[in-house]
């Protein structure tokens, strides 16, 4: 048995009520696909949440966080608050990151520093709360002897200028 | 309320061509199908042309080359161009309101009162 109702645009419902003829969608409500038999209710984005894209006939609302918050979820579910770079979120609020984590956003949780010496190398530049720690080279490839990379420049002739 | 209201039959020789005129109102006419039915005396109601919201046709055999249906959404009315008319097409036309915008296996929703096409020497 085809569906009456299968070649109503989106943007429309098939209104049972009117024997089936397609009606446009009410205000505040949109229909994505075609076919439909109600129209759902446009998404409001209120409170913590503010109007990215306004709702029309045939999409949704889509919703950002006003500021201070971002978005969590598909989308835009959930706002979650906003941390300093060096916190982290947790249920008593932002907390600053503990000796040895560092967070470099604004949300997300407090990581620990980089291991140099698991990959044998040195600590160049000490970690922070906002920052990973930077790894050197490692301790032998700064001891004195050690072979260099890139070989010494040719000596040149004294009195001859570079070609 | 949706009203639909035809136009235009009356008497015309064969080979003759008139232009019939359905005038909607009371639905959101340009996302709907219209659809366009005869019934001749002693018959039953036999489908002719069917246009879509998107402008898509579909005709009846017998009278494919020789109607044309079309549509101004901007007056909310739907045409049956009709030529080189047969004796054999003379019936009541009747506009048609069609279900969920099809034209494929149409199904009419409302109709209207018919108007009356003769086609005779």
């Known amino acids: 048995l085809q569906d009456l109702c299968s070649n109503c645009p989106a943007g429309t419902f098939c209104d049972n009520n009117r024997s089936q003829i397609c009606s446009p969608c009410p205000p505040n409500s949109f229909s994505s696909a075609g076919g439909q038999r109600t129209c759902d209710i446009c998404r409001q984005c209120k409170g913590v949440f503010k109007t990215r894209k306004e709702c029309s006939s045939t999409s949704n609302a889509e919703c950002d966080c006003i500021s201070g918050y971002h978005c969590l979820g598909a989308e835009c579910s959930m706002c979650e608050q906003d941390c300093k770079q060096g916190q982290e979120l947790t249920k008593k609020g932002c907390k600053d990151c503990c000796f040895g984590t560092f967070n470099d956003q604004k949300r997300g949780i407090c990581r620990p520093w980089t291991n140099c010496s698991l990959d044998g190398k040195s600590v160049l530049v000490n970690g922070t709360k906002e920052r990973d720690v930077v790894c050197g080279p490692s301790p032998a490839d700064l001891s004195p002897g050690a072979s260099s990379a890139t070989p010494p420049a040719p000596a040149r002739e004294p009195g001859h200028s570079p070609q | 309320e949706v009203q639909l209201l035809e136009s235009g039959g009356g008497e015309v020789q064969p080979g003759g061509s008139l232009r019939l005129s359905c005038a909607a109102s009371?639905?959101?006419?340009?996302?709907?199908?219209m659809g366009w039915y005869r019934q001749a005396p002693g018959k039953g109601r036999e489908f002719v042309a069917a246009?879509?919201?998107?402008?898509?046709?579909v005709y009846a055999e017998s009278v494919k080359g020789r109607f044309t249906i079309s549509r101004d959404n901007a007056k909310n009315t739907v045409y049956l161009q009709m030529s080189s008319l047969r004796a054999e097409d003379t019936a009541v036309y009747y506009c048609?309101?069609?279900?969920?915008?099809?034209?494929?296996?149409?199904?009419?929703?409302?109709w209207g009162q018919g108007t009356l096409v003769t086609v005779k020497p």
């Open positions: 009371g639905f959101s006419f340009s996302i709907n199908a």
């Open positions: 246009i879509e919201s998107g402008r898509n046709t």
């Open positions: 048609g309101l069609l279900k969920g915008n099809r034209v494929v296996s149409p199904s009419v929703a409302y």
